[in-house]
């Protein structure tokens, strides 16, 4: 039985489609292609005589069609108006003609989408971020990618407006990364350039690492005291120290050579992030003994958290 296959079935606007004829009868002497589901002289695209290899355009010929000796019809630079049915009539030597109908669908060529954001530097646990994929295209599927992966399942991620809008409710630091949107129709797909989400967070409660030089289990007079403060924060926090409430340097490491009992007291590391508007601190009590063993860092270290 004569059949028509469209390759591809879904065609992007501006591309080409080939209508392939299968199971052609042996005694064929010519072909005619028509636009539509039936044979109608007004809808004739092109006729072809096998013996002379002569193609004759009809009233529906647009100049973009090419007929081949095997009855296939190539349509180039397709438009959405080309969507629909096409009928091949095979003329046989016994004048009992055969007909078959095929179809294809033309979809608009998709533009490269772009992402707009209401906030590309949100603050953790405070801000929501809405990404919008533009432009709006009818009959199109919108997809989102985060760091090259499909969207994770999370109650904080909401899709709306036909998936055109991705909202992150109460952003977290691990939401940071590269966001892309992709628009798809059955014929083609196009992906946006990535947009980077920079989540501002912290400073978290700092930690103080004591490094004694030479290494020892206790703070003995004459040792070097190296206190290193660290706090997770974006941007990196500003560090500052206070000893017994008196402001010291603005470095991450506090170094005191050859400590003595005069260095006893509270050592506080303060961290500040102007971008989040948040501060934090930790206080440790240090005891230095003149000789023998000492308690070193007190177990009663405590921290302060400010917003």
């Amino acid at each position: 039985k004569l059949t028509i296959e469209s390759t591809p079935f879904n065609v992007a606007e501006g591309k080409e489609v080939l209508l392939l004829a299968h199971n052609l009868p042996q005694n064929r002497i010519g072909y005619s292609w028509y636009k539509g589901e039936r044979v109608d002289g007004n809808s004739l695209i092109v006729g072809y005589v096998i013996g002379t290899q002569q193609a004759t355009p009809g009233p529906a010929y647009s100049g973009r069609e090419t007929i081949y000796p095997n009855a296939s019809l190539l349509i180039q630079n397709v438009t959405q108006n080309d969507t629909g049915f096409y009928t091949l009539q095979v003329i046989k030597s016994d004048l009992v003609n055969e007909e078959a109908t095929g179809q294809f669908h033309v979809y608009p060529e998709l533009p490269k989408p772009s992402i707009s954001s209401n906030n590309s530097n949100p603050v953790e646990d405070k801000d929501a971020v809405a990404f919008t994929c533009e432009p709006e295209v009818q009959n199109t599927t919108y997809l989102w990618w985060v760091n090259g992966q499909s969207l994770p399942v999370s109650p904080r991620l909401q899709l709306s407006n036909g998936n055109m809008t991705l909202t992150l409710l109460s952003v977290k630091r691990n939401d940071a990364g590269s966001y892309e949107c992709e628009i798809q129709n059955p014929a083609s797909a196009n992906r946006s350039d990535p947009v980077t989400l920079n989540v501002l967070y912290g400073p978290d409660v700092p930690t103080i690492s004591p490094i004694i030089s030479p290494p020892d289990s206790s703070y003995l007079s004459g040792a070097n005291l190296n206190l290193s403060c660290h706090s997770a924060s974006n941007p990196s926090p500003q560090y500052s120290w206070r000893i017994n409430g008196i402001p010291q340097q603005h470095t991450q490491v506090l170094f005191i050579a050859k400590i003595t009992p005069n260095n006893n007291g509270t050592y506080a590391c303060f961290v500040s992030n102007l971008a989040t508007g948040r501060n934090n601190s930790i206080v440790k009590s240090i005891t230095v003994s003149a000789s023998g063993t000492s308690p070193g860092l007190s177990a009663g270290a405590h921290h302060h958290h400010h917003h």
């Epitope: 941007p235 990196s236 500003q238 560090y239 603005h250 991450q252 170094f255 102007l274 971008a275």
Partner: antibody, heavy 120, light 107 residues
Framework: QVQLVQSGAEVKKPGASVKVSCKAS????????LHWVRQAPGQGLEWIGY????????SYAQKFQGRVTMTRDTSTSTVYMELSSLRSEDTAVYYC?????????????WGQGTLVTVSS | DIQMTQSPSSLSASVGDRVTITCRAS??????LAWYQQKPGKVPKLLIY???NLVEGVPSRFSGSGSGTDFTLTISSLQPEDVATYYC?????????FGQGTKVEIK
Amino acid sequence: QVQLVQSGAEVKKPGASVKVSCKASGYIFTSYWLHWVRQAPGQGLEWIGYINPQTGYTSYAQKFQGRVTMTRDTSTSTVYMELSSLRSEDTAVYYCAREYGNYNYPLDYWGQGTLVTVSS
Amino acid sequence: DIQMTQSPSSLSASVGDRVTITCRASENIYGYLAWYQQKPGKVPKLLIYNAKNLVEGVPSRFSGSGSGTDFTLTISSLQPEDVATYYCQHHYGTPYTFGQGTKVEIK
């Protein structure tokens, strides 16, 4: 007291290189990052880059990438800034400056400056 | 890179006048802004950091304000020793960039 003492003035020909030194004293050298800033005659201040004396990590302004190299010698508490492929527009006073603290702080102590003149 | 734009480029005022210099960042720098004073033939001197924190030893007639993208340096009562060029600089990560400078003169 904190001091940054730079090497003396230099006159160089176009295409040559210059290496300026900056010796730090009066504080723990490895605790503070050191930056280089230049100022062309009658012009404003231009940031070149910085070095972390503790690790040797450097970060340079895009404009100077490939032409500038910053190094340090912890044994002498000295940092160096070498600028290659000199051109006349590199004529400027070059300053080393200490960052006030670690991370996102400005520059609190400055060297006296080194005048580099590039002329054929 | 973040661009810093200062205005005016120069000003002339009388002793005792209140003087205001503005600095605008091309993007949000939160409060990470510093002001420097550079007297003729001298090295720059840090006056203010974090937009409003006065460095120890700097006269209290100097003050800073602003956040986000718009910042101001104010000299409440101009003194003869304040004749200098003033620069703003963001310290919100590198690359650091400076404003083009404001030259302050006495009438």
